[in-house]
Interface confidence: low
């Protein structure tokens, strides 16, 4: 006989990421005896909630909670029964709910209450449903990326924990209703609202973060649609041969399109809008989303928002990844440089509807919107955030790291469950459980 070492007991945590366009559930796991080690927490499983985001249920709050049931039932199966009671469950809502909270706070409260009522029916340790601030969303995304890539501390071959010399990665998140940029900076921020100081594993981090509400992919598409209606009567970013009926009430219902709303528009009017495959007019339309006219600080990104120069390497995830992945994989276009990214956007915007469908068989959902999406990503990175060719070379577009989705959810759970200690770890021996 020989001694067989039993694998350690695992602990679990659940986060519901209630985004503007959909909700995702992430279940994380980690060895119970190594809670304070870095890179120990990983994704156990995930589940996409069918239908729209919880903010789309403003008129039917119980529908929001009902939509989550399928994934919660999956969680009952994925987490061992004996661990249910000790498994923290969080729901964090982002920009979709931030927008709803601006326009209809009562509806926003009703949705959160309905969701809370359902989540408390489950045997997990429910710890609240709340709307994250843009700053939290940015910082937790940054924490997730750097935790997964082991940039905070690492276990060395000499049997001690050390801080890797490579430094941290910046994080860029493009959601449905907002976009976030977060990176470590050495100098204090001129705008204190953009600075967050973190103490992780005994190290001090000064982080710049900003969230641009209404600059998420879906809201950008809505704003471009409103601009196209206002200025052209056709859509330069849509492919020639693509046409659809646009309900004005849908276009102007978002607070993001409020500025473009005509004074006496008929919300029930439907306008037929056609694409024109015009990359230059599309670029102009996208440029109109950014304002560079005034800056109350020594330097700004856009819209008068302070931003230090981008420094170091970055990971760009969520819709940044999906957009670039579409250009790379579906269209077969190179995107290694800013120049290539711009050329790829122009290429997509030049395609007619028939050409686009032929190149991307299976009529991918929202195919007509990829030109605008690509043009926006290119403009946001180059003109908005100020990436030049050299800095862009340090940007990686990634969906996952260490088999775990990159996003704010893991960082949020690590923070709320105190899985990243502020104090430095002592001398601990590493154990491999693979």
């Amino acid at each position: 006989t020989r001694d067989v070492r039993e694998p350690p007991a695992l602990k679990y945590g659940i986060v519901l990421d209630a985004g503007s366009s959909h909700t995702s559930m992430f279940i994380y796991k980690w060895p119970a005896d190594k809670e304070n080690d870095t890179g120990i927490v990983g994704q156990h499983s995930s589940c996409d909630v069918p239908g729209g985001g919880i903010s789309s249920y403003a008129d039917n709050p119980s529908g929001a909670s009902q939509s989550l049931v399928g994934c919660l039932e999956q969680a009952l199966q994925d987490v061992p029964k004996e661990r249910h009671a000790g498994t923290p469950l969080y729901l964090g809502a982002t920009a979709g709910m931030r927008l709803l909270n601006l326009t209809n706070p009562e509806a926003s409260t009703s949705v959160l209450m309905a969701v809370t009522h359902t989540l408390t029916q489950y045997p997990f340790d429910f710890r609240g449903a709340r709307i994250l601030s843009g700053q939290e969303e940015g910082v937790f995304g940054w924490v997730t990326a750097n935790y997964l890539l082991e940039n905070f501390i690492k276990y060395g071959w000499v049997g001690r924990w050390f801080r890797p010399r490579k430094g941290t990665l910046g994080a860029m998140d493009l959601g449905g209703a907002s976009t976030q940029i977060t990176f470590e900076t050495t100098s204090p921020a001129e705008d204190r609202a953009s600075e967050v100081q973190l103490h992780l594993y005994g190290q001090h981090y000064r982080v710049y973060t900003h969230s641009f509400l209404c600059y998420g992919r879906d809201q950008v598409l809505q704003r471009l649609l409103a601009s196209a209606l206002q200025t052209h009567g056709f859509h330069p970013c849509w492919p020639r041969g693509f046409s659809t009926q646009v309900l004005l009430g849908d276009v102007y219902q978002s607070p993001c399109t409020m500025a473009q709303r005509p004074q006496n528009f008929n919300s029930s009017a439907r306008v037929s809008l056609s694409g024109s495959s015009d990359p230059h007019l599309c670029r102009d339309l996208v440029s109109g989303l950014f304002s560079f006219s005034s800056c109350p600080f020594s330097r700004c990104s856009f819209n008068g928002v302070f931003q230090p120069p981008v420094a170091g390497n970055f990971v760009a995830f969520s819709a940044f990844f999906y957009t670039v992945d579409f250009l790379r994989t579906s269209m077969g276009l190179p995107v290694a440089t800013l120049q290539q990214l711009e050329a790829a956007a122009v290429n997509v915007c030049n395609q007619t509807w028939a050409q686009l469908q032929a190149r991307v068989p299976g009529q991918r959902a929202r195919l007509a919107d990829y030109c605008a999406g690509a043009m926006f990503v290119q403009q946001l990175l180059s003109r908005g955030y100020g990436f030049d060719e050299r800095a862009f070379g340090g940007v990686i577009f990634q969906k996952k790291a260490a088999d775990t989705a990159v996003g704010w959810a893991l960082g949020y759970m690590l923070n709320l469950t105190n899985l990243i200690p502020a104090d430095p770890p002592g001398l601990r021996k590493g154990t491999d459980f693979s």
Partner: antibody, heavy 125, light 106 residues
């Protein structure tokens, strides 16, 4: 092609129960909710309830709670609806309908995209 | 629950005629679907989300409206359009249908 085939007509006595079936083909059964709709003679269509076949979760119109029970057999790609304590007002054609949906700017839109041929249930002594 | 009232209850039209069926909701809804039901058949989806034509439906059918008032228009009626047309709301639980408009062809 996508098809929903329902069981045949039933004649039942008041107070009895009946279980009708709806066999799906041409698509992945667990990917779509299945709804049931009542059409009584000369009356409007009424939504009874639905089931999510993937997770066996059913939701009912308050008016049909206790009257209808919706279940599925995933292995047979079949949805069932049992009607209990039948009365003459339960005489109707009952349809199963697949719940299609699409997303448009983050809002979910649902509709019944495929219907079964209907099952006539007659309650008579 | 939201009550959908359709008018007229019955409509008689000649081939080639343009007709409009209406659907009024007791309170505001986000969108409406339209179904067509021929005698002895199950309903079939005609228009979803107020104005989108379902697969295989001829372009003579169109829908519009918002809030509490929606319409279904047939630009040039054909003999095979004889049927009952139902509107249906999926904005507020429980999902409800209108009482139907019966279209007869002269």
């Amino acid at each position: 092609q996508v098809q929903l085939v329902q069981s045949g007509a039933e004649v039942v006595k008041p107070g009895a129960s009946v279980k009708i079936s709806c066999k799906a083909s041409g698509y992945t059964f667990t990917d779509y909710n299945m709804d049931w709709v009542k059409q009584a003679p000369g009356q409007r269509l009424e939504w009874i309830g639905d089931i999510n076949p993937k997770y066996d979760i059913s939701t009912y119109n308050q008016q049909f709670k206790g009257k209808a029970t919706i279940t599925v057999d995933k292995s047979a790609s079949t949805a069932y609806m049992e009607l209990s304590s039948l009365r003459s007002e339960d005489t109707a054609v009952y349809y199963c309908a697949r719940r299609g949906f699409f997303l448009y700017y983050g809002i979910n839109y649902y509709y019944f995209d495929v219907w079964g041929q209907g099952t006539l249930v007659t309650v008579s002594s | 629950e939201i009550v959908l009232t359709q008018s007229p209850a019955t409509l008689s039209a000649s081939p080639g005629e343009r007709i409009t069926l209406s659907c009024s909701a007791s309170s505001s809804v986000s969108y409406i679907h339209w179904y067509q039901q021929k005698p002895g058949q199950a309903p079939r989806l005609l228009i979803y989300s107020t104005s989108n034509l379902a697969s295989g439906i001829p372009a003579r059918f169109s829908g519009s409206g918002s809030g509490t008032f929606y319409t279904l228009t047939i630009s040039s009626v054909e003999p095979e359009d004889a049927a009952v047309y139902y509107c249906h709301q999926w904005s507020s639980y429980p999902w409800t249908f209108g009482g139907g408009t019966k279209l007869e062809i002269k």
